[in-house]
C-alpha cells in the first residue's frame, strides 16, 4: 500500500487510509503497512487538540515551573492556561 495507507487483510487486495486520532485522543501506536493507527484517550494531565495519525497526548503545561499559576484548568482536549501570580501589596 501507498504511504499513509494500510492493507485491509492479509491478502492485501485493497488498502484503506490510516485513521487519525480525534482531539482528546492520542496515538498509542502509529499505523504500518498492515495495521491501522491505534488511538488512546488522553488521561488526566494530558491533552490533544488536533486530529492526527502521529501525535501522542501532550502533558499539560506546568505553570509552577514557570513561576505562574493555573488560570484555567486543562482538559483532555486543551492545555492549562497559565497566568501571573497575584502579588500581595
Amino acid at each position: 500500500c501507498e504511504e499513509g495507507w494500510h492493507c485491509t487483510s492479509e491478502a492485501c487486495e485493497s488498502c484503506v487510509l490510516h485513521r487519525s486520532c480525534s482531539p482528546g485522543f492520542g496515538v498509542k501506536q502509529i499505523a504500518t503497512g498492515v495495521s491501522d493507527t491505534i488511538c488512546e484517550p488522553c488521561p488526566v494531565g494530558f491533552f490533544s487538540n488536533v486530529s492526527s495519525a502521529f501525535e501522542k497526548c501532550h502533558p499539560w503545561t506546568s505553570c509552577e515551573t514557570k513561576d505562574l499559576v493555573v488560570q484555567q484548568a486543562g482538559t483532555n482536549k486543551t492545555d492549562v492556561v497559565c497566568g501571573p501570580q497575584d502579588r500581595l501589596r
Partner: antibody, heavy 115, light 112 residues
C-alpha cells in the same frame, strides 16, 4: 461478476431503529472494506463510514457516531448498517460500496421515516 | 473537514458540444506520497453513483475517452467533449485524502 445487493425499502416511525443489509458476491468478501453513503432526497452524498469484514474494524464519520452501527457477517458475505433513534432527517437513500473509489456500488436502500 | 465546492449547480449543454465542470477543495489534496486523492463520480437519473475518474485524470474502466480530468492541489476540472445523451446526470467530486471523505454538492448536466 462483483455485485452488491441491498435490502428493500423501509418505512419506519420516528424514534425506531432499522437495520439494512448489503450482500456481496463475485469476490472474496473479507478482502475489501464496505463503505456506506447517505443521499437525502434531491441532495448530495455523505460518507457514513466503513466496516472491514476481515477484522470487524469500523471507521465512522464523526457526524454519524451514535446514529449508525456498521457490522458484517463473513458466513453470508453480508454487511449491515443499523440506524437508531430515527427522525425525518434520516430519510434518504443509503448506498453500500466496495472500496468507495472502485466501481462497485449497491442499488441503494430507500429509508422513509414518517409517523 | 475538507469542504468540496462545486460552484455551478447545473449546466445546460447542446449535444455534441463540450462542457467543463469545476471543483475546489478547502485544502490541498496532494499527499506527501505524491498522489492527489481526488475523484469524479457520475450519478445518472435513478441510478447509483459510478466512478468516472480517479487521482485527477485516470479514467475508470469502461469510461469513454470523451471524459478527461485535470487540475492540481485545490482546483480541479472535468471536461466532457462531444456530450451525448447518456452523459446526463449529476457529477460529484470527492476527496479521499482525509476522514471523513467528503463530496461536492454536485453539478447537474442537462441537454438543451
Amino acid at each position: 461478476e462483483v455485485q452488491l445487493q441491498q435490502s428493500g425499502p423501509e418505512l419506519v416511525k420516528p424514534g425506531a431503529s432499522v437495520k439494512m443489509s448489503c450482500k456481496a458476491s463475485g469476490y472474496t468478501f473479507i478482502n475489501y472494506v464496505i463503505h456506506w453513503v447517505k443521499q437525502k432526497p434531491g441532495q448530495g452524498l455523505e460518507w457514513i463510514g466503513y466496516i472491514n469484514p476481515y477484522n470487524d474494524d469500523s471507521n465512522y464519520n464523526e457526524k454519524f457516531k451514535g446514529k449508525a452501527t456498521l457490522t458484517s457477517d463473513k458466513s453470508s458475505s453480508t454487511a449491515y448498517m443499523e440506524l437508531r433513534s430515527l427522525t425525518s432527517e434520516d430519510s434518504a437513500i443509503y448506498y453500500c460500496a466496495r472500496d468507495l473509489i472502485g466501481s462497485y456500488w449497491g442499488q441503494g436502500t430507500t429509508l422513509t421515516v414518517s409517523s | 473537514d475538507i469542504v468540496m465546492t462545486q460552484a455551478a449547480p447545473s449546466v445546460i449543454v447542446t449535444p455534441g458540444e463540450s462542457v467543463s465542470i469545476s471543483c475546489r477543495s478547502s485544502k490541498s489534496l496532494l499527499h506527501s506520497n505524491g498522489n492527489t486523492y481526488f475523484y469524479w463520480f457520475l450519478q445518472r437519473p435513478g441510478q447509483s453513483p459510478q466512478l468516472l475518474i480517479s487521482r485527477i485524470s485516470n479514467l475508470a474502466s469502461g469510461v469513454p475517452d470523451r471524459f478527461s480530468g485535470s487540475g492540481s492541489g485545490t482546483a480541479f476540472t472535468l471536461r466532457i467533449s462531444r456530450v451525448e445523451a447518456e452523459d446526463v446526470g449529476i457529477y460529484y467530486c470527492m476527496q479521499h485524502l482525509e476522514y471523513p471523505f467528503t463530496f461536492g454538492a454536485g453539478t447537474k448536466v442537462e441537454l438543451k
